[in-house]
């Protein structure tokens, strides 16, 4: 029961996390114009991974897509790649974990197979969460660097009577959504991995018990039974942990980030 709850909760948490990663990736507010200590402008600039927007006090908002691929900063490309890899891994992880859920019966699927799939999806969720956290953190670091550079340049340049206002950007809502979503996906993945341990089938091995009946002996070897039948006093339960060996290869077999840029 606890295993099913852990697995189910891990799935739900990961689902919320991946939905958050998708939302963060699509959001326009990765960086927003810093309003602190700035002249009051009637426009508000904000930027996402795919386009930049300007909201005017008139109520009019104009967004322009980044219609170039080669002209974009390498860091932005890297963040895009990390987020997309995170989404793809997360989506595949969700698909795998649906079939791995203990509460869902699909044909005559063995518990060992479900355990394997749970572990696989768990690792995928962990990697997905790490990709999202890494992507958001790289972008945040880029913002911090640019912020201090533009602060240093703020009062230099034109000279004389004419002044140019340097637009500085700070953390947007998408960064916080991304960090939280990545964390949730990571936690969900860990929960799936924990659930995997309890999902492995219990195999009961019994020592052969001989019954001597008049004149001839018949040996019963009930080692194949799943549940204990009370034969003999040397009953020994052994948990089998199958899985884990293949998951590394499975994770590596999914497309690399470069396939999505």
């Amino acid at each position: 029961m606890a295993v099913t709850a852990c697995q189910g909760l891990g799935f739900v948490v990961s689902l919320i996390g991946i939905a958050g990663i998708i939302a963060a990736t699509c959001m326009d507010q990765w960086s927003t114009q810093d309003l602190y200590n700035n002249p009051v402008t009637a426009v508000f600039n904000y930027q996402g991974l795919w386009r930049s927007c300007v909201r005017e006090s008139s109520g009019f908002t104009e967004c322009r897509g980044y219609f170039t691929l080669l002209g974009l900063p390498a860091m932005l490309q890297a963040v895009r790649a990390l987020m997309i890899v995170g989404i793809v891994l997360g989506a595949i992880g969700l698909l795998v974990s649906i079939f791995a859920l203990k509460c869902i019966r699909i044909g005559s699927m063995e518990d060992s197979a479900k355990a394997n799939m749970t572990l696989t999806s768990g690792i995928m969720f962990i990697v997905s969460g790490l990709c999202a956290i890494a992507g958001v953190s790289v972008f945040a670091n880029m913002l911090v660097t640019n912020f201090w550079m533009s602060t240093a340049n703020m009062y230099t340049g034109m000279g004389g009577m004419v002044q140019t206002v340097q637009t500085r950007y700070t953390f947007g809502a998408a960064l916080f959504v991304g960090w939280v979503a990545g964390g949730l996906t990571l936690i969900g993945g860990v929960m799936m991995c924990i659930a995997c341990r309890g999902l492995a089938p219990e195999e009961t091995n019994y020592k052969a018990v001989s019954y001597h009946a008049s004149g001839h002996s018949v040996a019963y070897k009930p080692g194949g039974f799943k549940a204990s039948t009370g034969f003999g006093s040397n009953t020994k339960n052994k948990k089998i942990y199958d899985g884990g060996a293949r998951t590394e290869d499975e994770v590596q077999s999914y497309p690399s980030k470069h396939d999505y840029v």
Partner: antibody
């Protein structure tokens, strides 16, 4: 068709108060920034106040800050300018205008005259 | 506050001739976010409210004749009427739409020579 009709102008003594109204029609009132612009007799245009579209932030020049208040009633599709502590230099034709892209003002009312005199 | 300075204060041009009005702002009106200049030009005829001609420094408002054009970037802007018509006699104002408080130029009175 966008229509803006100002009302509430008139003669007022210095230190007095007046409330201008602007009835708007032909567009989604809450979505657009609205402004008041005035023009003293024989003089140029002077921006008086703006209430931004959507979030309804308000902005004023130093010359009227603390004395004038811009507001809107979405239910009535009306824009208001509450003018307190009026001075002789506030005498002007007050125009209500709706903004659009570039924060420009493509739509204007015909104006209402406010005269501050003892 | 941003100071908008128009030149000349008044201008007399013959019908069919080119009229040029300049506007200078004390700070750049170029927004780096969309690379647009937040400068607007208005025309005002006696007894009428102002009429929007040009926004974003160079984008003509719909319904405005194509003889009107705007140019410039940063701090220096120009309104050009390529071939003056009798109905173009009016006062022309430039306006900063980037910084609060929004400020207008003092106006340029255009007359027929």
């Amino acid at each position: 068709e966008v229509q803006l009709v100002e009302s509430g102008g008139g003669l007022v003594k210095p230190g007095g108060s007046l409330r201008l109204s602007c009835a708007a029609s032909g567009f989604t009132f809450s979505s657009y920034g609205m402004s008041w612009v005035r023009q003293a007799p024989g003089k140029g245009l002077e921006w008086v106040s703006t209430i931004s579209g959507g979030d309804s932030y308000t902005y004023y020049p130093d010359s009227v800050k603390g004395r004038f208040t811009i507001s809107r009633d979405i239910a009535k599709n009306s824009l208001y300018l509450q003018m307190n502590s009026l001075r002789a230099e506030d005498t002007a034709v007050y125009y209500c205008a709706r903004s659009y892209n570039a924060n420009s003002l493509p739509y204007w009312g015909q104006g209402t005259l406010v005269t501050v005199s003892s | 506050d941003i100071v908008m300075t128009q030149s000349p204060d008044s201008l007399a041009v013959s019908l069919g001739e080119r009229a040029t009005i300049n506007c200078k702002s004390s700070q750049s009106l170029l927004n780096s976010g969309n690379q647009r200049n937040y400068l607007t030009w208005y025309q005002q005829k006696p007894g009428q409210p102002p009429k929007l001609l040009i926004y974003w420094a160079s984008t003509r408002e719909s319904g405005v004749p194509d003889r009107f054009s705007g140019s410039g970037s940063g701090t220096d802007f120009t309104l050009t009427i390529s071939s003056l018509q009798a109905e173009d006699v009016a006062v022309y104002y430039c306006q900063n739409n980037y910084f609060y408080p929004f400020t207008f130029g003092q106006g340029t009175k255009l007359e027929i020579k």
